[in-house]
């Protein structure tokens, strides 16, 4: 007859995964709190410090590639200009336009202006007196 095996003392044994510490834990299991709070965006400024782009909708993927000759002779910073006002940043759907436009079309808005009819091309100090 085998001797009875004494019951092990378990009072100092910790669960491997610390389950006793987590005894009172209530898993969220999907308990999601949605806060429907209106954000005050009235003081948000665009990178250029203007509100020009306030109605801008990011294309989130629509890229427009336009094949146009580019006149770089009068390139200025995007900030402080309206040059970028119609830009749609994007990333995926690609629309390729093979539109042939010459340099005249690029500078069409300047043709006939006082600056255009007084200053020679590439002329230095431009000043309307």
């Amino acid at each position: 007859q085998t001797a009875p095996v004494p019951m092990p003392d378990l009072k100092n044994v910790k669960s491997k995964i610390g389950s006793t510490e987590n005894l009172k834990h209530q898993p969220g299991g999907g308990k999601v709190q949605i806060i429907n709070k209106k954000l005050d965006l009235s003081n948000v400024q665009s990178k250029c410090g203007s509100k020009d782009n306030i109605k801008h909708v990011p294309g989130g993927g629509s890229v427009q590639i336009v094949y146009k000759p580019v006149d770089l002779s009068k390139v200025t910073s995007k900030c402080g200009s309206l040059g970028n006002i119609h830009h749609k940043p994007g990333g995926g759907q690609v629309e390729v336009k093979s539109e042939k436009l010459d340099f005249k079309d690029r500078v069409q808005s300047k043709i006939g202006s006082l600056d255009n009819i007084t200053h020679v091309p590439g002329g230095g100090n431009k000043k309307i007196e």
Partner: antibody, heavy 112, light 106 residues
Framework: QVQLQQPGTELVKPGASVKLSCKAS????????MHWVKQRPGQGLEWIGN????????NYNEKFKSKATLTVDKSSSTAYMQLSSLTSEDSAVYYC?????WGQGTTLTVSS | ENVLTQSPAIMSASPGEKVTMTCSAS?????MHWFQQESSTSPKLWIY???KLASGVPGRFSGSGSGNSYSLTISSMEAEDVATYYC?????????FGGGTKLEIK
Amino acid sequence: QVQLQQPGTELVKPGASVKLSCKASGYPFTNYWMHWVKQRPGQGLEWIGNINPTNGDTNYNEKFKSKATLTVDKSSSTAYMQLSSLTSEDSAVYYCTRVTYWGQGTTLTVSS
Amino acid sequence: ENVLTQSPAIMSASPGEKVTMTCSASSNVNYMHWFQQESSTSPKLWIYDTSKLASGVPGRFSGSGSGNSYSLTISSMEAEDVATYYCFQGSGYPYTFGGGTKLEIK
């Protein structure tokens, strides 16, 4: 200050040629187109042509192509307009202009 | 050639009266410029780039228009405004002037 100096009057005979001058001062001469304009007595203004003083490039009103020749002398900042085969129809005031500034005009009289 | 037609050719206005003159182009232009010429003097640039006043031009003058139809307006006529006004285009060669509007005072 910007000035465009033109001789007041020129009297020439029919069939002859004349070279009108326009001396510019007070600004960088080669930076600006020089235009020439004709005005007959009691009439309106007619654009003759212009010249780029940097390289001598010219544009002419077709009407004046065989009549006027535009040139410049960069060293003296002077623009010239030569008029050939003169007739009474060429009697007029001729202005050189930078558009924002105008010369006083040269009164050309073609008479025998 | 882009023909500029000004109307009326001659007009007169009383002091304080509003004055409008027009310039019609046979082809569209990007900008219209206006010159004032008082009798027996050289023309002066008066309005440039359609609506900008040249240096020293009184604020009662204004310019407007687009395409092939442009106008110069004086909000309240003054005696010193008596002159001939010419429109001018530089949008295509040859550059051209209108025939002028002679403004007189009543």
